[in-house]
Interface confidence: low
C-alpha cells in the first residue's frame, strides 16, 4: 500500500495554441488529466490500472504551479494504490483547455487537447524526487515524482504492515525495512517482554514492566536472590526457600532450642565450672566450698 | 465499552483439538488487533497468538505450528485452533481486544484502548 506522488512545477505554451495549432480564445485555460497504469514497453490506451486524478485548471498558457499540499492538497497529485508496488509503472499526463466550467471528458469537445505526454521505467520506492521535463515543439512540461509508502507501511514495495505501539500486543516502532525497534525497557520477538531490573534474579524473579523486579514465593530482596526461611525460624537461615538451618548453639525445628546454655547465660555462679547437657540443661561443677544448682550456696 | 464472551474451552485428551471463539460487541472503532493470551495455576498470564487488521499473524514460539488464530471482521470475531494439545497447554484461555482512539495521533505512540475477557477453562488430560 502507497502512494504514488507527481508534482506539476511549470508548464509553457508561449504562443497559447492546442495541440492542433490552433490558439485558445482568449488563452489557454490549461488543465491536467493523469493515468498510471502498468508498465508497458509502448505506452498504449486502456485502463489506468494504477489510478487516475485530475487537476482543476491551473493556469493560463505558461505558469508555474505553486505547491498546494498543505491546502486543497492538489499538488503534489496524490494516486493511492493498496497493492505492492512492482517496481515498473507507465505515466501519461494530458494538458487540456477548459473553455467553460465543465471539465468532465464527456464535456469537453475533442480538439480541446493541448499537449499530452508518457513516460515509462522503473521506480524504486523512497522519499526521493525524480525531476523530468518533457518537451514538444509547442508545449514545455516539468514535473517531479516519487512513490511513498502508506502510513504503516514499509519495505522495499510497501508490502511490509508495522504499527507502532505501545500495549498489551507490543512496545515498538517501525524500522524503515518494517522490522521492529523496541521502546526501551521491552525485549523478544514482538517487544512484549519486560526487560526486569538489571540483577533481578533469573529464575527466582520476574517482572511485568521494565525496570521492576518482582519475586516469586519464596524470595525476597531487591534483587529476589534471598530467600525466605521458614515461618517462625528463630535463630536459622535458608539457602532455599522455607528452610532452617540452625546458626551455631541452636537446635530443633525453629532454631529455637538453646543449645549452648552456658555461653548465652553463664547460670553458674561463684566461679563454677559450666556444662551444656542438651536443649536448656546444664551442669554446673562447684568449686570448693559452694553448692547448689548454680552453686550459689 | 466493548464485550468479549470467549466459548469452545473443555477437557480434552493429550494430542486433541479444541476451537477457541472470541465474540467482541459493543462500540468497536478505529483499528482493532484481537488475540488470545492464558493463565496456568500459579504462573503470570502469557500471550499465545494475535491477529492485526491487515492479517499479520503472531505465535508464540511454544504454540507454533500447532495453534492458528483467525477472525472474522463482518462478525468482530476471532479463533483460536489448538491442535495437538499438549499437558502444559493447560489454562484459562483469555481473549484480547486491542482498538486504538479515532483520535489517534500518529505523531505520537498509539493510544490503545485494551479489553480482556472472562476467560475459558483449557483442560488437557494426559
Known amino acids: 500500500s502507497g502512494v504514488f506522488q507527481l508534482q506539476l512545477q511549470e508548464f509553457i505554451n508561449e504562443r497559447g495554441v492546442l495541440a492542433s495549432g490552433r490558439p485558445c480564445e482568449p488563452g489557454c485555460r490549461t488543465f491536467f488529466r493523469v493515468c498510471l497504469k502498468h508498465f508497458q514497453a509502448v505506452v498504449s490506451p486502456g485502463p489506468c490500472t494504477f489510478g487516475t486524478v485530475s487537476t482543476p485548471v491551473l493556469g493560463t498558457n505558461s505558469f508555474a504551479v505553486r505547491d498546494d499540499s498543505s491546502g486543497g492538497g492538489r499538488n503534489p497529485l496524490q494516486l493511492p494504490f493498496n497493492f505492492t508496488w512492482p517496481g515498473t509503472f507507465s505515466l501519461i499526463i494530458e494538458a487540456w483547455h477548459a473553455p467553460g466550467d465543465d471539465l468532465r471528458p464527456e464535456a469537453l469537445p475533442p480538439d480541446a487537447l493541448i499537449s499530452k505526454i508518457a513516460i515509462q521505467g522503473s521506480l524504486a520506492v523512497g522519499q526521493n524526487w525524480l525531476l523530468d521535463e518533457q518537451t514538444s515543439t509547442l508545449t514545455r512540461l516539468r514535473y517531479s515524482y516519487r512513490v511513498i509508502c502508506s502510513d504503516n507501511y514499509y519495505g522495499d514495495n510497501c508490502s511490509r504492515l508495522c504499527k507502532k505501539r505501545n500495549d498489551h500486543f507490543g512496545h515498538y516502532v517501525c524500522q524503515p525495512d518494517g522490522n521492529l525497534s523496541c521502546l526501551p525497557g521491552w525485549t523478544g520477538e514482538y517487544c512484549q517482554q519486560p526487560i526486569c531490573l538489571s540483577g533481578c534474579h533469573e529464575q527466582n524473579g520476574y517482572c511485568s514492566k521494565p525496570a521492576e523486579c518482582l519475586c516469586r514465593p519464596g524470595w525476597q530482596g531487591r534483587l529476589c536472590n534471598e530467600c525466605i526461611p521458614h515461618n517462625g525460624c528463630r535463630h536459622g537461615t535458608c539457602s532455599t526457600p522455607w528452610q532452617c538451618t540452625c546458626d551455631e548453639g541452636w537446635g530443633g525445628l525453629f532454631c529455637d532450642q538453646d543449645l549452648n546454655y552456658c555461653t548465652h547465660h553463664s547460670p553458674c555462679k561463684n566461679g563454677a565450672t559450666c556444662s551444656n547437657s542438651g536443649q536448656r540443661s546444664y551442669t554446673c561443677t562447684c568449686r570448693p566450698g559452694y553448692t547448689g544448682v548454680d552453686c550459689e550456696l | 465499552q466493548v464485550q468479549l464472551q470467549e466459548s469452545g474451552g473443555g477437557l480434552v485428551q493429550a494430542g486433541g483439538s479444541l476451537r477457541l471463539s472470541c465474540a467482541a460487541s459493543?462500540?468497536?472503532?478505529?483499528?482493532?488487533?484481537m488475540g488470545w493470551y492464558r493463565q496456568a495455576p500459579g504462573k503470570e498470564r502469557e500471550f499465545v497468538a494475535g491477529?492485526?487488521?491487515?492479517?499479520?499473524?503472531y505465535y508464540a514460539d511454544s504454540v507454533k505450528g500447532r495453534f492458528t488464530i483467525s477472525r472474522d471482521n463482518a462478525k468482530n470475531t476471532v479463533y483460536l485452533q489448538m491442535n495437538s494439545l499438549k499437558p502444559e497447554d493447560t489454562a484459562v484461555y483469555y481473549c484480547?481486544?486491542?482498538?486504538?482512539?479515532?483520535?489517534?495521533?500518529?505523531?505520537?505512540?498509539?493510544?490503545?484502548?485494551?479489553?480482556w475477557g472472562q476467560g475459558t477453562q483449557v483442560t488437557v488430560s494426559s
Open positions: 491477529i492485526n487488521d491487515g492479517g499479520n499473524t
Open positions: 484480547a481486544v486491542s482498538t486504538t482512539y479515532p483520535s489517534y495521533n500518529e505523531s505520537q505512540y498509539a493510544d490503545w484502548l485494551a479489553y
Open positions: 459493543g462500540s468497536i472503532s478505529g483499528d482493532v488487533e
